[in-house]
């Protein structure tokens, strides 16, 4: 929908004559009739398919036409159309003489025509006026014209309807081409979708108007990116709503059970070492000189009988002192002043004198160690067995007892579980870290493909004429039970009509 606008600017008829050459009396009182129609290569009479318009008398003989002429006429002249502008047109402008006030065609003398011009061509929709001037032997007409779209119509041929709005159905204005231009804060095809607060979480937040962020259940925070833990969750967090993942040192469904009483309450006194031993439970290992559940009580240091080999203990301000019996020395009388003559080496150890007999050293036989060969050597202390193998002391040597699936001196070799072909019925064996897996052929299942799976031979509905189908589980084939009047392996032949075999 649009308007063809014609602006008449100046008409010159210096001699004041009609087209017939006859002069007007007293002068040519001039008005115009305009006919707008579809494009014609040669403009011919006929219906004004795009519209017509007439002016009142605009002047006598020669005159300039004002913008928006008085006397009820309008300049520019408006020729509205309610269709897609085709881009081409034909235009006929006739100047007529009006002897009286009645401008109807039937009221005018037959020779009242002053001049007639006809043009045709292309015209694109736009705001710019095209200026034209048409001259005949006696007259000259200067005018301009253009096509513009009606309100709410846009595009190259005024075919796009667009009406700006700011309501539930959309928030937009219209661009010159008729496309929607969303108002700030709105998006989407019809600008119905608000643009949420910048950074609002795409899944956990939403908005009903621009620049807000409403949180879905279980989420909170300015950008709805913080989950709300389970109600009752005390010392825990969440990564999705209503979770309760316990902080370190806490346990239980609501993370309210204290598993790290030592850290949270520091119950052990006097530098004792604290060990957690369950919920709200702990053990204090006291430093020498202290006792009590929390090592809160100070001991006499001699109470623990620190002096060995019959040494006597004497309390002192800064600790204690051991008085050793003959033949012993050291802080706790733990060292002996024995010599080889006292046979100090056990388990067949050989004694060697040192420092002119003031000291000795024991040379121990295999499997024994210690300063007096008093300790048996444990060859398993270094955990030599790999893959969970068990270490066994065997006299002077050791051996590893391997877990199933492993072999070698130290259980370091992995036995292939597939070596003994465990998969039945042609199943394919796959070695896994902790065992094996069988991939079974069609018709078999189970961990070792040992179970025969029946194939439903009736699934393809092979029986005709409403016959009942049965699967023979032993051969995976079907059998058709024919209704009365039909025969054949599929019940495909009516009785009495022999099958027409090709032989």
């Amino acid at each position: 929908s649009g308007v063809f606008q014609l602006q008449l600017q100046e008409f010159i008829n210096e001699r004041g004559v009609l087209a017939s050459g006859r002069p007007c009396e007293p002068g040519c009182r001039t008005f115009f009739r305009v006919c707008l129609k579809h494009f014609q290569a040669v403009v011919s009479p006929g219906p004004c398919t795009f519209g017509t318009v007439s002016t009142p008398v605009l002047g006598t003989n020669s005159f300039a036409v004002r913008d928006d002429s008085s006397g009820g006429g309008r300049n520019p002249l408006q020729l509205p159309f309610n269709f897609t502008w085709p881009g081409t047109f034909s235009l006929i402008i006739e100047a007529w003489h009006a002897p009286g006030d009645d401008l109807r065609p039937e009221a005018l003398p037959p020779d009242a025509l002053i001049s007639k011009i006809a043009i045709q061509g292309s015209l694109a929709v736009g705001q710019n006026w095209l200026l034209d001037e048409q001259t005949s032997t006696l007259t000259r007409l200067r005018y301009s014209y253009r096509v513009i779209c009606s309100d709410n119509y846009y595009g190259d041929n005024c075919s796009r309807l667009c009406k700006k709005r700011n309501d539930h159905f959309g928030h937009y204005v219209c661009q010159p081409d008729g496309n929607l231009s969303c108002l700030p804060g709105w998006t989407g095809e019809y600008c119905q979708q608000p643009i949420c607060l910048s950074g609002c979480h795409e899944q956990n937040g939403y908005c009903s108007k621009p620049a807000e962020c409403l949180c879905r259940p279980g989420w909170q925070g300015r950008l709805c990116n913080e989950c709300i833990p389970h109600n009752g969750c005390r010392h825990g967090t969440c990564s999705t709503p209503w979770q309760c993942t316990c902080d370190e040192g806490w346990g239980g469904l609501f993370c309210d059970q204290d598993l790290n009483y030592c850290t949270h309450h520091s119950p052990c006194k006097n530098g004792a070492t604290c060990s957690n031993s369950g919920q709200r439970s702990y053990t204090c290992t006291c430093r020498p000189g202290y006792t009590g559940v929390d090592c809160e009580l100070e001991l006499s240091e001699c109470d623990s009988n620190p002096c060995r080999n019959g040494g006597s203990c004497k309390d002192q301000e800064d600790g204690y002192h051991c008085l050793c019996p003959p033949g012993y020395y050291g802080l706790h009388c733990e060292h002996s002043t024995l010599s080889c003559a006292d046979s100090p080496c056990f388990n067949g150890g050989s004694c060697r004198e040192r420092n002119q007999g003031a000291n000795y050293a024991c040379e121990c036989p295999p499997n024994f160690t210690g300063s007096n060969c008093e300790k048996k050597v444990d060859r398993c202390t270094s955990n030599p067995c790999a893959n969970g193998g068990q270490c066994l002391n065997r006299g002077p040597s050791r051996m590893c007892r391997c877990r199933p699936g492993f072999t070698g001196t130290y259980c370091e070799l992995h036995v292939s579980d597939c070596a003994r072909n465990p998969c039945a019925h042609g199943g394919t064996c796959h070695d896994l870290e902790n065992g094996l897996m069988c991939t079974c052929p069609a018709g078999f299942s189970g961990r070792r493909c040992e179970v025969r799976t029946s194939i439903d031979a009736c699934a393809s509905s092979p029986c005709f004429n409403r016959a009942t189908c049965y699967t023979d589980l032993s051969t995976d084939t079907f059998v058709c039970n024919c209704p009365y009047g039909f025969v054949g392996s599929r019940c495909e032949f009516p009785v009495g009509l022999p099958p027409s075999f090709p032989w």
Epitope: A211, E212, C213, Q220, I228
Partner: nanobody
């Protein structure tokens, strides 16, 4: 049953101070962001301040910035609003609430609400 109970309101002269408290029960207070909202006489509710669940992030409306301080004690299930340099325009019923939605300046939709405490600033 969820309950938010505000206290600490009263009549105070311009330039004076008040401390509002909000005690929560019926839900795990320490898991929720909290907010103070006020309704001046004859007007709609306006957001005052907010604090995140752990207490590490605080937010204030421009009108109270620098004068009011929000804080919380999760062990006591209590939210606080320390109001200094009070002005007559701070007169309102003050509510504590759990924010559910935020606008460009602060929260504007809420889940749980208290019943409110009246603060009047007048000479």
């Amino acid at each position: 049953e969820v309950q938010l109970v505000e206290s600490g309101g009263g009549l105070v002269q311009p330039g004076g101070s008040l401390r509002l408290s909000c005690t929560a029960s019926g839900f795990t207070f320490g898991n929720y962001d909290m907010s103070w909202v006020r309704r001046p006489p004859g007007k709609g509710p306006e957001w005052v301040s907010a604090i995140n669940s752990g207490g590490g992030s605080t937010y204030y409306a421009d009108s109270v910035k620098g004068r009011f301080t929000i804080s919380r004690d999760n062990a006591k299930n209590t939210l606080y609003l320390q109001m200094n340099s009070l002005k007559p325009e701070d007169t309102a019923v003050y509510y504590c609430a759990t924010p559910r939605g935020w606008g460009p300046t602060g929260p504007h939709e809420y889940g749980y609400w208290g019943q409110g405490t009246q603060v009047t600033v007048s000479s």
